[in-house]
Amino acid sequence: FQTFKGLKWDHHNITYWIQNYSEDLPRDMIDDAFARAFAVWGEVAPLTFTRVYGPEADIVIQFGVAEHGDGYPFDGKDGLLAHAFPPGAGVQGDAHFDDDELWSLGKGVVIPTYYGNSNGAPCHFPFTFEGRSYSACTTDGRNDGTPWCSTTADYDKDGKFGFCPSERLYTEHGNGEGKPCVFPFIFEGRSYSACTTKGRSDGYRWCATTANYDQDKLYGFCPTRVDATVVGGNSAGELCVFPFVFLGKQYSSCTSDGRRDGRLWCATTSNFDTDKKWGFCPDQGYSLFLVAAHEFGHALGLDHSSVPEALMYPLYSYLEGFPLNKDDIDGIQYLYGRGSKPDPRPPATTTTEPQPTAPPTMCPTIPPTAYPTVGPTVGPTGAPSPGPTSSPSPGPTGAPSPGPTAPPTAGSSEASTESLSPADNPCNVDVFDAIAEIQGALHFFKDGWYWKFLNHRGSPLQGPFLTARTWPALPATLDSAFEDPQTKRVFFFSGRQMWVYTGKTVLGPRSLDKLGLGPEVTHVSGLLPRRLGKALLFSKGRVWRFDLKSQKVDPQSVIRVDKEFSGVPWNSHDIFQYQDKAYFCHGKFFWRVSFQNEVNKVDHEVNQVDDVGYVTYDLLQCP
């Protein structure tokens, strides 16, 4: 091993801040990868790693591309994957990851699944089905053309599966209410049996959600199939078409046939022999966990190792299991001593924000966030033009129809609790993703489902309902939701994206950049209404004034939460208004504030906590 000029941290309670995220993985997976990467070093040295939410962290983690604000620009795909600086102040100790890479768990793109029997677990690539290996979603075994994947390595053994994002399941944006494509459909007198970019100048693939676009003018955008979008070849950016014909043989997944280098490829039309259109299939990507563990080694003071089996060797190779070699362990223990973690005391200075107050403090719970959604950031820019926004018809009809053979069919299209996890009883939910008062009812969101709580006698609780059935295009996991009391528009936030619904018509996703929020704002914890079309927008201990009409924050207005709301947890993960009170949720608890619903006073009169309680027992009235 080698160390870096003898540099090391002078304390053993290391703090880190995840400043921004890659779109390649869900945010909770990124959080987990970084936490596991730190834990690798904490296992063998007396170090603890605490996540904080500001630039005062020892190790600031950032995704960037090309020139990204330091003297060491990234280089596009492959080559340099990431870099880190040795321990010290400022940029020293920070770790930067090249977002031109495909970040994965080391085994290919991470594809969320829908329906099936795996509760939305991501696809496992490669997987075995009927003795064959698949490295992308497939339509094999089905007669309805809906792509699916196994969520374990062996479908034949485990039988666990889900459906991949597909226009046969749903569409995004547009005015088709999220319904699946109807194939074939008529557009400008011509019949289309697949998504098309015809009539658009922006390259977005769309389809009609009825059999005749010319007549009905109903359409949606087709989800991007990241597992099947090719690179290189002569069709970069196009989708694999399965099945395709090559040298007279039919292929239902990517193949290396015809190549000496073993690289997987596919045709982008149904017949390679006639059309000669092809590209390389997405690669396995780089394990964010492994690369992060290597970079964090640097950030702790380790230089490269000359031992090829060591994590600190300067070449990436994917491996499973505990990644440290004896050389890595010797190096970190040389710097920080033997043994594992010290007493798990919090670091002396984590952040400047106040800590949560009673009830008993809990570890900060980070609201889980959504899989990245794809599609235009604003409404459609050309033909097909949007249809009328009034009287929306019911949401999508749900799961694809069953095929005659394996894999098994998806669940019923009715709102059902069969595939809901955790249990269908909201009283069993520890922490909800988001809570909001919408149309007079308190809505509790969790993992793509929601319950409605109507505050009256009888059966006050309804649900669960599929979120995407009511609000098509929303991701499975939300950070917060808010209904504008004046216009009744509903705002949803997930990660750095926002969707705004007027009835069933959606605008979005829009990036938080468009709201005037910088990259350090990684999610929105909630909004509270003010008068005159204004609201307060919250994110991790800070609050901005937000104009609901222009959908912009006033950047000069940002203050610390405790300046306006004394005694609430600074890191509340969900904030909402209910019956004219403001609620700040942290873990299982809420802090209720008698909220002065008016424009900020000059002296920032502080709103006082008047109650602290349990979300389930006190709000949901669970037994």
Epitope: Y72, D75, Q92, H304, P314
Partner: antibody, heavy 124, light 107 residues
Framework: EVQLLESGGGLVQPGGSLRLSCAAS???????DMWWVRQAPGKGLEWVS?????????FYADSVKGRFTISRDNSKNTLYLQMNSLRAEDTAVYYC?????????????????WGQGTLVTVSS | DIQMTQSPATLSLSPGERATLSCRAS??????LAWYQQKPGQAPRLLIY???YRATGIPARFSGSGSGTDFTLTISSLEPEDYAVYYC?????????FGQGTRLEIK
């Protein structure tokens, strides 16, 4: 002992081309980022181009972008600079330099070894 | 691009004296600064990296200090072989840039 040895300089007419080489020895060449830095007669130092250790990524000063191409052959421990459309203002001693940093550990700053330089004169 | 300004342009001192060379960056570059010595007809030679670390084989009379925007190279007691041109170079932001140089000459 680390050594960098440039070659390929000479007199060339404006609009002409030259290919400079830098033979490296005494260190694991493939691990390090490599640079070309030039110095016009009587003037200061100016960076020209860098190629990262992996060989793919390259960066260029605005003054040479589109005309010069840096490359490396890790199997031959050699760095190259292909110079096309040469101009009078490209006249300089061209040095190849080894970055003290390598790969993804970017705390180091400085070029710890330099070649002796090769003179490129662009004149009609 | 970050501008690196060295002062003075020329410094005339006698052997045994203390030399102080200054380098100022137009914006903060943390400690990403290197100093080089160049003698006529020779390639530059790395003296100091990361503002304050002496490169291999560099005598202890050479020292570097500073961070942010202001940096200093100090030669505690000048030796005859120290008369040369000295350049600073930053890598706190892209692209890297060099100062225009300070000529250290015998008084």
């Amino acid at each position: 002992e680390v050594q960098l040895l440039e070659s390929g300089g000479g007199l060339v007419q404006p609009g002409g081309s030259l290919r400079l080489s830098c033979a490296a020895s005494g260190f694991t060449f493939s691990w390090y980022d490599m640079w070309w830095v030039r110095q016009a007669p009587g003037k200061g130092l100016e960076w020209v181009s860098v190629i990262y250790s992996s060989g793919g990524p390259t960066f260029y000063a605005d003054s040479v972008k589109g005309r010069f191409t840096i490359s490396r052959d890790n199997s031959k421990n050699t760095l190259y600079l292909q110079m096309n459309s040469l101009r009078a203002e490209d006249t300089a001693v061209y040095y190849c330099a080894k970055d003290r940093a390598y790969g993804d550990y970017v705390g180091w700053n400085g070029f710890d070894y330099w070649g002796q330089g090769t003179l490129v004169t662009v004149s009609s | 691009d970050i501008q690196m300004t060295q002062s003075p342009a020329t410094l005339s001192l006698s052997p045994g004296e203390r030399a102080t060379l200054s380098c100022r960056a137009s914006q903060s570059i943390s400690s990403f600064l290197a100093w080089y010595q160049q003698k006529p007809g020779q390639a530059p030679r790395l003296l100091i990296y990361d503002a304050s670390y002496r490169a291999t084989g560099i005598p202890a009379r050479f020292s570097g200090s500073g961070s942010g925007t202001d940096f200093t190279l100090t030669i505690s007691s000048l030796e005859p072989e120290d008369y040369a041109v000295y350049y600073c170079q930053q890598r706190g932001n892209w692209p890297i840039t060099f100062g225009q140089g300070t000529r250290l000459e015998i008084k």
